[in-house]
């Protein structure tokens, strides 16, 4: 065959799709690759091409379009399944052709069984709801396209295994989930099962996702400095061990970048020829505000590092700040014995 | 404990109408969604309806649907079934069940029955 | 509608006896599958729900598997008191519907 362009095994595209439930895949061709649509490709007399390959095995097959009441069928650019069976796991390759011109992407397809409680391996997408922040909407996702605007599917919404019937401050509106005054306590795995019918069978759509209730931006701050602070002073002798830890305190902020730097005498530590590392960790409270320290080390600091200026600078959406650490050298103690004789005019 | 009780069971024509209750107790009412199961004699069960938590959603089987409605009130804690237009094979014992708020959706608690006979 | 089918409608079987009653749907219903046991002049009871989970308070010996059309009941050793009407029920649609019932009756 001749030569055609291939994308090889989209692996961005991880698809998880339940066991016996319906699933439509849309070629990634249209979606990633190309600049052209379905439509645009049809109408010049190109032609979608379906392959497959089963897990665990290197063979290429066609898929088999004449199942029983049309289990996989494919429309337009979509793959349709109706509904999947654990055994349709494995790569999938679609192909688009004409006698000059071709091109083709595989992806993977996994299909995730699930219990009774919709426990499974699938990977949850995650829905981020602020704190006490008025009334915030989840909506099942991904069932556009299942049937069509004059079926009448029904919603029911869970929470972990149960339905949601009467919850405080949670109410099931048919698509979509309203959280009242979203609360630490509404944290959880949320599903919407959809029912429908379609030509005398029925069909679920199950979707799970994750809720995290985090801090909510009318309580957002610019970066607290905790430490260093004018509390602390760090008196060092040379040749003993400096640290000085940054300590930083960040609001959650919806996809903003937290950044904690030191300098040393206005100069990035990478810049500056002393021997200093930094080690930073970093941890989370229930609402995502970020605590970050990062601590400064000098195994062996001179008397030149004690003059130096170390500041901690810190930066988020919300603003930049900096706070320099008091470092200075200790001053020896008097060496008492000779102190005295000399007081005492010994020779 | 989680009690179901049903009543308004009785003799009735072909044509004419019936209300069935069924009071609960000892669990929050409200919380639940409730179905009514008819069984004729000695024959076996038959789903007939349900009716969701807040009555926002009812459905019923073919056999019962526009003559048939399921209802609640949910401050008096009783659930109920208008039979309107009763046919003779409508004569059956007609459980109230409760459904658990999980996905598989059991009945976890029945009442006792009311008999219905539907008879010239 | 989703038709439920159960197998056999009627069985006789001896105390300490293991039997199986199976129920069959017309299309794949995943695990929304729970069986009841109703005797005489007594409201159903429920035994096992999503296909396999025990409910509280049922003795062991009662046992659900399968998954999508295809489902069994079994007692591992039947006890006098078990001898009664079982009833698998799906409520993978909205509108319910039960497996015509198996009586089970001492030999």
């Known amino acids: 065959s001749e030569r055609c362009d291939d994308w090889g095994l989209d692996t961005m595209r991880q698809i998880q799709v339940f066991e016996d439930e319906p699933a439509r895949i849309k070629c990634p061709l249209f979606e990633h690759f190309l600049k052209f649509n379905y439509s645009t490709a049809h109408s010049a007399g190109l032609t979608l091409i379906w392959y497959w390959t089963r897990q665990d095995r290197d063979l290429e097959e066609p898929i088999n379009f004449r199942l029983p009441e049309n289990r996989i069928s494919k429309e337009k650019d979509v793959l349709w399944f109706r509904p999947t069976l654990l055994n349709d796991t494995g790569n999938y390759t679609c192909m688009l052709r004409n006698t000059t011109y071709c091109s083709k992407v595989a992806f993977p397809l996994e299909v995730v069984q699930k219990d009774s409680c919709f426990n499974s391996p699938m990977k949850l997408p995650v829905h981020k709801l602020y704190i006490e922040y008025g009334i915030q909407r989840i909506t099942c996702p991904n069932v556009d396209g299942y049937f069509p605007s004059s079926v009448k599917p029904t919603i029911t919404w869970y929470m972990g295994c149960y339905k949601i019937q009467n919850f405080n401050n949670v109410i099931p509106e048919g698509m979509n989930l309203s959280f009242l005054i979203a609360l630490i306590s509404n944290n959880g795995n949320y599903t919407c099962v959809v029912t429908y019918p379609e030509n005398g069978r029925t069909f679920h759509l199950t979707r799970t996702l994750t809720v995290k209730v985090v801090g909510s931006p009318k309580n957002a701050v610019p970066p607290v400095i905790h430490s260093p602070n004018d509390h602390v002073v760090y008196e060092k002798e040379p040749g003993e061990e400096l640290l000085i830890p940054c300590t930083v305190y960040f609001s959650f902020l919806m996809d903003s970048r937290n950044e904690v730097w030191w300098t040393i005498d206005g100069k990035k530590p990478d810049d500056i020829t002393i021997d200093v590392t930094i080690n930073e960790s970093i941890s989370h409270s229930r609402t995502e505000d970020e605590t970050r320290t990062q601590i400064l080390s000098i195994k062996k600091v001179t008397s030149e590092d004690l003059k130096r200026s170390y500041v901690c600078h810190a930066r988020s959406a919300k603003g930049e700040v900096a706070k320099a650490a008091k470092v200075k050298q200790k001053v020896p103690a008097p060496r008492y014995t000779v102190e005295l004789a000399c007081g005492f005019g010994a020779t | 404990q989680v009690q179901l009780v049903e009543s308004g069971g009785g003799v009735v024509q072909p044509g004419r109408s019936l209300r069935l209750s069924c009071a609960a107790s000892?669990?929050?009412?409200?919380?639940?969604?409730i179905h009514w199961v008819r069984q004729a004699p000695g024959k076996g069960l038959e789903w007939v309806a349900v009716i969701w938590y807040d009555g926002s959603n009812k459905f019923y089987a073919d056999s019962v649907k526009g003559r048939f409605t399921i209802s609640r009130d949910n401050s008096k804690n009783t659930l109920y079934l208008q039979m309107n237009s009763l046919r003779v094979e409508d004569t059956a014992v007609y459980y109230c069940a409760r459904e658990e708020g999980i996905a598989v959706a059991p009945f976890d608690y029945w009442g006792q029955g009311t008999l219905v006979t539907v008879s010239s | 509608d989703i038709q439920m089918t159960q197998s056999p409608s009627s069985l006789s079987a001896s105390v300490g006896d293991r039997v199986a009653i199976t129920c069959r749907a017309n299309q794949s219903i995943a695990s929304y599958l729970n069986w009841y046991q109703q005797k005489p002049g007594k409201a159903p009871k429920l035994l096992i729900y999503g296909a396999s989970s025990l409910q509280n308070g049922v003795p062991s010996r009662f046992s659900g598997s399968g998954s999508r059309t295809d489902f069994t009941l079994t007692i591992s050793s039947l006890q006098p008191e078990d001898f009664a009407t079982y009833y698998c029920q799906q409520s993978y649609s909205t509108e319910i519907t039960f497996g015509q019932g198996t009586r089970l009756e001492i030999k």
């Open positions: 000892g669990f929050t009412f409200r919380n639940y969604g």
